[in-house]
């Protein structure tokens, strides 16, 4: 017999959100596995006139994007499967599966604290070869991309510390709009606004990681409320 | 393919102003940066500047600031450098030269160059 | 600005063997991925020609016998063999800032 009521809604809810888990973990897999084996980015990831690589950060971070895809899609299952077919192993599974994950983030939210002036300096640089492949390498798209990205994201255009290239990417259409003279140009460095993202933005980054930490405690507490009800319609 | 032709030689007297032109053809003038040389007789090259040719945004080396007017035309995919208060120290040889079309501060394809005289 | 001195300023050198000729920068020119020193030849008469860009990679249409190495503050080009034809002035140029500037120059003559 099924469960009924209130926690027949739990199951639904359960059931909804883990699926849309599932695809968010199945679209950032399909995305990683793109990048990671698409021959555009692979040059950028190795980002080469020659052979000299990026920052191993980057190169490492294809590989964390594709363990979260799948991951998410893992977890997004157990949920969905466990939920709908009401079995108290797969949502137990889940259920032990949020602990981990959650562990995971608060770890990941230390370290990331703790180490936030080298990833910074990671992602400047990482910045800057991107920058560099763009204006050097007439056919790196990839780079391109990635460089538009950062600017429109950061709403800065270049870097100070590569002031020729900066004045070639602003007439590529890198740059926002905006900032299309050369004398505007070094009010927007890029490098500047990474700092800012770093250190005075830092609270945003805290506010989406416990955004997600509460969404993992509110499906905690569904699974075991689901597995409670599952139990006791289960006894009568 | 692409060619630059530059104005021919020019005398001129000392405190005077002259106006060098670049004619490019064989590629988008309009989204490509044009930047100058000067080379004086038996020395070496000295960079005077760049233009983008697009919108006549231009980047100078300080030492040339007030001596030399980059301008472009793109309608007819010339561009211009304007030298004032002529002195001797002008007398040189300048020569433009095209940037590859990401702006790849590459001085990739150049003018057979124009001779300055100054002379009294 | 970055000054770029060339040594020596002329050579002499016997038709089929090596030419070498180094560029010292007043400051590194390089970053993590790409050196912005290249290579010009200019023979008598002519505006300078491109050779070599990023310190080592050839021009399309520059034959193998050139090639160039180095980063940071010191860059040299070869030629090997060396040929009749390779007798002009040779500079060094760098676009890591503004200004852009060359070096002293280098006049290669063939024995």
């Known amino acids: 017999m099924g469960v009924e009521g209130c926690t027949k809604c739990i199951k639904y809810l359960l059931f909804v959100f883990n699926f849309v888990f599932w695809l968010a973990g199945g679209v950032i897999l399909g995305v990683a596995l793109w990048l990671r084996h698409d021959p555009q980015t692979t040059n950028l990831l190795y980002l080469e006139l020659g052979d000299k690589p990026a920052p191993n950060t980057f190169y490492v971070g294809i590989y964390i994007l594709i363990a979260v895809g799948a991951v998410m899609m893992f977890v997004g299952f157990l949920g969905c499967y466990g939920a709908i077919q009401e079995s108290q192993c797969l949502l137990g599974t889940f259920f032990t599966c949020l602990v981990i994950l959650f562990a995971c983030e608060v770890a990941a939210g230390i370290w990331g604290f703790v180490n936030k002036d080298q990833i910074a300096k990671d992602v400047k640089q990482f910045y800057d070869q991107a920058l560099q492949q763009a204006v050097v390498d007439d056919d790196a798209n990839n780079a391109k991309a990635v460089v538009k990205t950062f600017h429109e994201t950061l709403d800065c255009c270049g870097s100070s510390t590569l002031t020729a290239l900066t004045t070639s990417v602003l007439k590529n259409n890198l740059c926002p709009s905006g900032s299309n003279i050369i004398s505007n140009l070094f009010k927007e460095d890029c490098h500047q606004k990474i700092d800012d993202l770093f250190s005075g933005k830092l609270y945003l980054i805290g506010i989406a990681a416990i955004v997600v930490a509460v969404i993992m405690i509110f499906e905690m507490i569904l699974s075991m409320v689901l597995c409670c009800g599952i139990r006791n319609s289960s006894v009568y | 393919q692409v060619q630059l032709q530059q104005s021919g030689p020019e005398l001129v007297k000392p405190g005077a102003s002259v106006k060098i032109s670049c004619k490019a053809s064989?590629?988008?003038?309009?989204?490509?940066?044009m930047n100058w040389v000067k080379q004086r007789p038996g020395k070496g090259l000295e960079w005077i500047g760049r233009?983008?040719?697009?919108?006549?945004?231009?980047i100078y080396n300080g030492k040339f600031k007030g001596k030399a007017t980059l301008t472009a035309d793109k309608s007819s995919s010339t561009a211009y450098m304007q030298l004032s208060s002529l002195t001797s120290e002008d007398s040189a040889v300048y020569f433009c030269?095209?940037?590859?079309?990401?702006?790849?501060?590459?001085?990739?394809?150049w003018g057979q160059g124009s001779a300055l005289t100054v002379s009294s | 600005d970055i000054v770029l001195t060339q040594s020596p300023a002329s050579l002499s050198v016997s038709l089929g063997q090596r030419a070498t000729i180094s560029c010292r920068a007043s400051?590194?020119?390089?970053?993590?991925?790409?050196?912005?020193m290249h290579w010009y030849q200019q023979k008598p008469g002519q505006p300078p020609k491109l050779l070599i860009k990023?310190?080592?990679y050839l021009e399309s249409g520059v034959p193998a016998r050139f090639s160039g190495s180095g980063s940071g503050t010191d860059f040299t080009l070869n030629i090997h063999p060396v040929e009749e034809e390779d007798a002009a002035t040779y500079y060094c140029?760098?676009?890591?800032?503004?200004?852009?500037?060359f070096g002293t120059g280098t006049k290669l003559e063939i024995k």
């Open positions: 064989g590629y988008t003038f309009s989204s490509s940066w």
């Open positions: 400051k590194s020119v390089s970053t993590s991925i790409y050196s912005y």
């Open positions: 140029e760098h676009s890591r800032e503004f200004p852009f500037t």
């Open positions: 233009i983008y040719s697009g919108d006549g945004d231009a």
């Open positions: 990023y310190a080592s």
């Open positions: 030269a095209r940037e590859g079309k990401t702006g790849d501060l590459l001085l990739r394809s």
